[in-house]
Interface confidence: medium
């Protein structure tokens, strides 16, 4: 799981992914549900080795969160070829994995 620390790093990660699915976890250190799902998010990154997993701390990267129109945490966004192909909010493990399977 790659930690994103700037808008440039986010754009570069999307570019570098090419055709691969990119899953972005927008979270915050003070967000309880975010902490709860984080280990699961990390386990998915091992399970789905052909998928790129990114983490964005909304406090450290307010510009990325703002550009991606993140309104609550955690929010998961899914990108392919730089295009957003899915999104949902909430610490829902099953929906997270189901969405990855749908889009991979």
């Amino acid at each position: 799981v790659k930690q994103i620390e700037s808008k440039t790093a986010f754009q570069e990660a999307l570019d570098a992914a090419g055709d691969k699915l990119v899953v972005v976890d927008f979270s915050a250190t003070w967000c309880g549900p975010c902490k709860m799902i984080k280990p699961f998010f990390h386990s998915l990154s091992e399970k789905y080795s052909n998928v790129i997993f990114l983490e964005v701390d909304v406090d450290d990267c307010q510009d990325v969160a703002s550009e991606c129109e993140v309104k609550c945490m955690p929010t998961f966004q899914f990108y392919k070829k730089r295009e957003k192909v899915g999104e949902f909010s909430g610490a829902n493990k099953e929906k997270l994995e189901a969405t990855i399977n749908e889009l991979v």
Partner: antibody, heavy 117, light 105 residues
Framework: EVQLQQSGAELVKPGASVKLSCTAS????????MHWVKQRPEQGLEWIGR????????KYDPKFQGKATITADTSSNTAYLQLSSLTSEDTAVYYC??????????WGQGTSVTVSS | QIVLTQSPAIMSASPGEKVTMTCSAS?????MYWYQQKPGTSPKRWIY???KLASGVPARFSGSGSGTSYSLTISTMEAEDAATYYC????????FGAGTKLELK
């Protein structure tokens, strides 16, 4: 306890339509995808499609595109499967299912649809 | 769309016998799922993530495989294992195999 309760058996005439229901209890259907699966008599399982009840987004096996329409009503926690222009090929048991990953899978008891004149 | 081919279609085994059934995918997949179904009942998830046993499934069952080739094995057949087993993949368009009917000899 999670349960999926399906509507009762249907006997319908060729050319007609039928709408089956699947009411969930023990969880909110907005939190997952609801799937429908077909099983013809003495045959295997066929995935029809699924809905994300949170936004109404659907996906179908191309084979069932135009035949099946999946909808959901989050206020009643119910998913629906509508089948149109019925023929004898549509005679089957139809299951709604919560196909999960690390958590438990759940299936409805099935609804038998018989197409006969 | 990924096609799953199960073999054999029908097989029989005596109590205590080792049983292996296979499922071949037309394209590489990451994980296989297996379901058990008995007549007049809904399918039950039996194995998930290729090799993990669902809750309540006896330890005599095991699953293995990768890429396009997967299998379900029963180390010692018991009467209650007689059923039809379906393999299932969950890519963008989920599909099921045609099933292997396991009968008690």
């Amino acid at each position: 306890e999670v349960q999926l309760q399906q509507s009762g058996a249907e006997l319908v005439k060729p050319g007609a339509s039928v709408k089956l229901s699947c009411t969930a209890s023990g969880f909110n259907i907005k939190d997952t995808f609801m799937h429908w699966v077909k099983q013809r008599p003495e045959q295997g399982l066929e995935w029809i499609g699924r809905i994300d009840p949170a936004n109404g987004n659907t996906k179908y096996d191309p084979k069932f595109q135009g035949k099946a329409t999946i909808t959901a009503d989050t206020s009643s926690n119910t998913a629906y499967l509508q089948l149109s222009s019925l023929t004898s090929e549509d005679t089957a048991v139809y299951y709604c299912a919560l196909l999960q990953y690390s958590a438990m899978d759940y299936w409805g008891q099935g609804t038998s649809v018989t197409v006969s004149s | 769309q990924i096609v799953l081919t199960q073999s054999p279609a029908i097989m029989s085994a005596s109590p205590g016998e080792k049983v292996t059934m296979t499922c071949s995918a037309s394209s590489r997949i990451s994980y296989m799922y297996w379901y058990q179904q008995k007549p007049g009942t809904s399918p039950k998830r039996w194995i998930y993530d290729t090799s993990k046993l669902a809750s309540g499934v006896p330890a005599r069952f095991s699953g293995s495989g990768s890429g396009t080739s997967y299998s379900l094995t029963i180390s010692t057949m018991e009467a209650e294992d007689a059923a039809t087993y379906y393999c299932h993949q969950r890519s963008s368009y989920p599909t099921f195999g045609a099933g292997t009917k396991l009968e008690l000899k």
